[in-house]
Interface confidence: medium
């Protein structure tokens, strides 16, 4: 455009700029070392020092580890970006007893409140569950309409908050690919190794190049590129697609130049700990106890407890979907303890496959 | 398997440079930043600094700044470090060493050493 | 910088015995400690990261914990191969540092 010319002529003769043609103007040249918080910087401020991935820049300007959400008990709640740690809170159905910088050092199941007692506040990430007494004559299960909604989650009866001892050695990863395991011993396994090809065993779409062309000579207009299997994360960053190897995973979208795979457990299982994009534990779809009812909560960060169904009654643990389906199995089922904030139509017939948001952070293999 | 093989023994005089290499193999070269760690013998562990192969970024240790320059050819999946204006202070291994993953996982690759002796 | 101190240059031990390594930092790492194993002429071996993470293939008789400023490396049961050099690391920010090494020698 001839009319540019007097804006890119500003820039020549000016070492320290550059014009970028994508925004039309003069941009401030980083110094060697420094890394542009934006496509133009305009100046210096606008510069800084680059991290590896994993880590953030900190007040101080050194690269500091954003904390690790790996152990089972915890969940992302905010992404490690290149200012700021990753935040981790303990998984739905439990709360933090000892908290820790950007994290919870001990995270306790919600308790359940003993009979005669009913649910004041619903337990969160923070706070346990506060109860309280029940009105005369008002069954403890059903002492309020909440109380009452199709359920969300459930977890064992507890006394008295249970804590889970942080996970060592490689408990704090995912399963591994062989549908023979147990859920319990396959959830301390891995996933995939960093430097493994694409999860199913073909080539994935190349998600480093942009459909933009090579770089135009001192064009800010460059897309980064990642290599195969990793995807340009919103902090620029090159991030390992998750992989949907595991026997009890399938691909639901695949891993693109700037989105990662996703993958959900396959047909007539059901997620019981959630990952980013993915799902750390698939179970079999669940067989109901008959002793036990559950007490919904909350969808979102709350989670419901199982107790003694009211005398008379019986459990109701697989109730019709909204959308009309008949449930998997005309049996009661028990309602897993599901770490994510998934619709509220659960259990889900076993026909669909099971997709559940993303809360925790697969761990890469260490090679 | 990722492996780093490092180039031979270097003999220096003080006052002059010297330049190692990584030859890095088992994996896509830029996918992992290059960390350069100092040992000195009968001494512990210092990390020099790193580069990001793939854009040829580079961040030291601010006490080897004037000391170590970090370079990374994509094309050989090598990298460089050249240490120049040496003393005696500086004969030690230097090794390269890459994580395991991106997940805080630390040195989980290492090369075999490059031992560098300065002595008139 | 972070320093990382390793109290004890030696430690001596028996085989069969449990041994426990100890670090402090300068500050509060939370927990991005990582320790490596070092044998003469040898380059070292990553064992333990976050605290408590065990390294890909590294037997199940080393153990890490610790948090904020305190970190401990344990051999339940030392084996003659387990003889070499200890040393922690802090991965939390930059520059990474190292303490000085624990050497791990037979009574």
């Known amino acids: 455009f001839p009319q540019d010319r007097p804006f890119e002529d500003t820039c020549h003769g000016n070492p320290s700029h550059y014009y970028d043609k994508a925004v039309r103007r003069c941009c401030y040249r980083c110094p060697m070392g420094l890394f542009p918080t934006q496509q133009c910087p305009q100046r210096p401020t606008d510069c800084r020092k680059q991290c590896e991935p994993d880590y953030y820049l900190d007040e101080a300007d050194r690269c500091t580890a954003c904390v690790t959400c790996s152990r089972d008990d915890l969940v992302e709640k905010t992404p490690c970006a290149w200012n700021s740690s990753r935040v981790c809170e303990c998984r739905p159905g439990m709360f933090c007893s000892t908290s820790a910088v950007n994290s919870c050092a001990r995270c306790f199941f919600h308790s359940v409140c003993p009979a005669g007692m009913i649910v004041k506040f619903p337990g969160t990430a923070q706070k346990n569950t506060v109860c309280e007494p029940a009105s005369p004559g008002v069954s403890p299960a059903c002492a309020s309409p909440e109380n009452c909604k199709e359920p969300s989650s459930g977890t064992i009866p507890q006394a008295k908050p249970t804590p889970v001892s942080p996970a060592t050695s490689s408990a704090s990863t995912m399963p591994v690919r062989g549908g023979t395991r147990l859920a319990q011993e396959a959830a301390s396994k891995l996933t995939r190794a960093p430097d493994s090809p694409s999860s199913v065993g073909r080539p994935s779409s190349d998600p480093g190049l942009s459909p933009t062309q090579p770089c135009p000579e001192g064009s800010g207009d460059c897309r980064k590129q990642c290599e195969p299997d990793y995807y340009l994360d919103e902090a620029g960053r090159c991030t390992a697609c998750v992989s949907c190897s595991r026997d009890d995973l399938v691909e639901k979208t695949p891993c693109a130049w700037n989105s990662s795979r996703t993958c959900e457990c396959r047909p007539g299982m059901i997620c019981a700990t959630s990952a980013t994009n993915s799902c750390a534990r698939c179970v079999p779809y669940p067989i109901c106890a008959a002793e036990t009812v559950t007490k919904p909560q909350d969808m979102a960060e709350k989670d419901t407890t199982f107790e003694a169904p009211p005398l008379g009654t019986q459990p109701d643990c697989n109730p019709t979907p909204e959308n009309g389906e008949a449930p998997a199995s005309t049996s009661p089922t028990q309602s897993l303890l599901v770490d994510s904030q998934a619709s509220k139509t659960l259990p889900i017939p076993t026909s669909a496959p099971v997709a559940l948001s993303s809360t925790g952070k697969p761990v890469l293999d260490a090679g | 398997q990722v492996q780093l093989q490092q180039s031979g023994a270097e003999l220096a005089k003080p006052g002059a440079s010297v330049k190692m290499s990584c030859k890095a193999s088992?994996?896509?070269?830029?996918?992992?930043?290059m960390h350069w760690v100092k040992q000195r013998p009968g001494q512990g562990l210092e990390w020099i600094g790193y580069i990001n192969p793939s854009t040829g970024y580079t961040d030291y240790n601010e006490k080897f700044k004037d000391k170590a320059t970090l370079t990374a050819d994509k094309s050989s999946s090598t990298a460089y470090m050249q240490l120049s204006s040496l003393t005696s202070e500086d004969s030690a291994v230097y090794y390269c060493?890459?994580?395991?993953?991106?997940?805080?996982?630390?040195?989980?690759?290492w090369g075999q050493g490059t031992l560098v002796s300065v002595s008139a | 910088d972070i320093v990382m101190t390793q109290s004890h240059k030696f430690m001596s031990t028996s085989v069969g015995d449990r041994v426990t390594i100890t670090c402090k930092a300068s500050q509060d790492v939370s927990t991005a400690v990582a320790w490596y194993q070092q044998k003469p002429g040898h380059s070292p071996k990553l064992l333990i990261y976050w605290a408590s993470t065990r390294h890909t293939g590294v037997p199940d008789r080393f153990t890490g914990s610790g948090s904020g400023t305190d970190y401990t490396l344990t051999i339940s049961s030392v084996q003659v191969e387990d003889l070499a050099l200890y040393y922690c690391?802090?991965?939390?920010?930059?520059?990474?540092?190292f303490g000085s090494g624990t050497k791990l020698e037979i009574k």
């Open positions: 088992g994996y896509t070269f830029t996918t992992y930043w």
């Open positions: 060493v890459r994580r395991g993953s991106y997940d805080g996982n630390p040195f989980a690759y």
């Open positions: 690391q802090q991965h939390y920010s930059t520059p990474f540092t």
